[in-house]
């Protein structure tokens, strides 16, 4: 049905590759391994995706259903303020932080948490159903 279609956004096509979970108009990958923040980002890029950028509270709430107490890296960093990897500011949720050295963002079922970027954690990647479509 979707072959040959050229969508300008991530809409309409139902399929995600193996190992990816479809929710809404995107595909999500929840890692089985643990890496530091930078290596998690590189993993996602090497699979033609991005470390998870959450667009709104609705997406965050729905993703948290799939999470446990364990934290997962997401595409959120503190560079003079918390920003997503697409450059947008974090403006729909609070993030807990215990120290100024915790400059990378993670998520679990309870919310967002700052962490030292060197800690190995699980991670979440996000992409469009087709690799030739830009996520942002």
């Amino acid at each position: 049905l979707c072959q040959g279609s050229n969508y300008s956004t991530c809409a309409s096509c139902p399929s995600c590759p193996d190992r990816w979970m479809k929710y809404g108009n995107h595909c999500y990958y929840f890692s089985v391994e643990e890496k530091d923040w930078n290596s998690s980002l590189e993993f996602c890029l090497a699979r033609d995706s991005h470390l998870l950028v959450i667009t709104d509270n609705q997406e965050m709430s729905l993703l948290q259903v799939f999470l446990s107490e364990a934290f997962c890296w997401i595409g959120l960093r503190n560079n003079s303020g918390w920003r997503w990897e697409d450059g947008s500011p974090l403006n729909f949720s609070r993030i807990s932080s215990n120290s100024f050295v915790q400059t990378c963002g993670a998520i679990n079922k309870n919310g967002l948490q700052a962490s030292s970027c060197e800690v190995p954690l699980h991670w979440v990647c996000k992409k469009c159903p087709f690799a030739d479509q830009a996520l942002f």
Epitope: E33, S39, A46, R47, E118, A131, D132
Partner: antibody
Framework: EVQLVESGGGLVKPGGSLKLSCTAS????????MSWVRQTPEKRLEWVAT????????NYPDNVKGRLTISRDNAKNNLYLQMSLLKSEDTAMYYC????????????WGQGTSVTVSS | GIQMTQSPSSLSASLGERVSLTCRAS??????LNWLQQKPDGTIKRLIY???SLDSGVPKRFSGSRSGTDYSLTISSLESEDFVDYFC?????????FGGGTKLEIK
Amino acid sequence: EVQLVESGGGLVKPGGSLKLSCTASGFTFRNYAMSWVRQTPEKRLEWVATISESGNYNNYPDNVKGRLTISRDNAKNNLYLQMSLLKSEDTAMYYCVRDDWEGRAMDYWGQGTSVTVSS
Amino acid sequence: GIQMTQSPSSLSASLGERVSLTCRASRDIGSSLNWLQQKPDGTIKRLIYATSSLDSGVPKRFSGSRSGTDYSLTISSLESEDFVDYFCLQYASSPWTFGGGTKLEIK
């Protein structure tokens, strides 16, 4: 059976160039990120490049950035490593490796192709 | 990058003997460690991934374990084909880094 077969190695002068190739079979090549790893004459192993499934993203350690370029042709199941401005310290056996999809580094290795940089 | 210190660099042992090789990471890498085997012809094969999971086809005499930032590969009863080179590889943090290798020799 997963197979990775490298070619293109040889003797090259310092400052010279060389292009290595790797032909993959036994798996769906376009679904895997791929890497090159080298082994020095002293047997030290060193990761030198990774490329994404589609070829849109590359990653290199700092010591080879700008001199080594990884690329791929998914239609031909081929992986490449273009090497330029070669130095004696680039002398090594170069291995084509498949990246474990789940992120557990390299799961299959080729037999290697030897590169010697010497005047 | 993370330094992986592998020991011993060489080890002499007898057929049937139990041996352990160790890699120490310079910082926390969780369970993100592989063990590789290299034959004399240069062929490299992954034996163990994620610290303790055996790759398919790898004999059960091989096992992996972890204590803090120390990682061990144990061969419970050495066979003739085990007398080759072994390397560890961490993949928690880019750049991926390898141990210096252990050459296992027959006594």
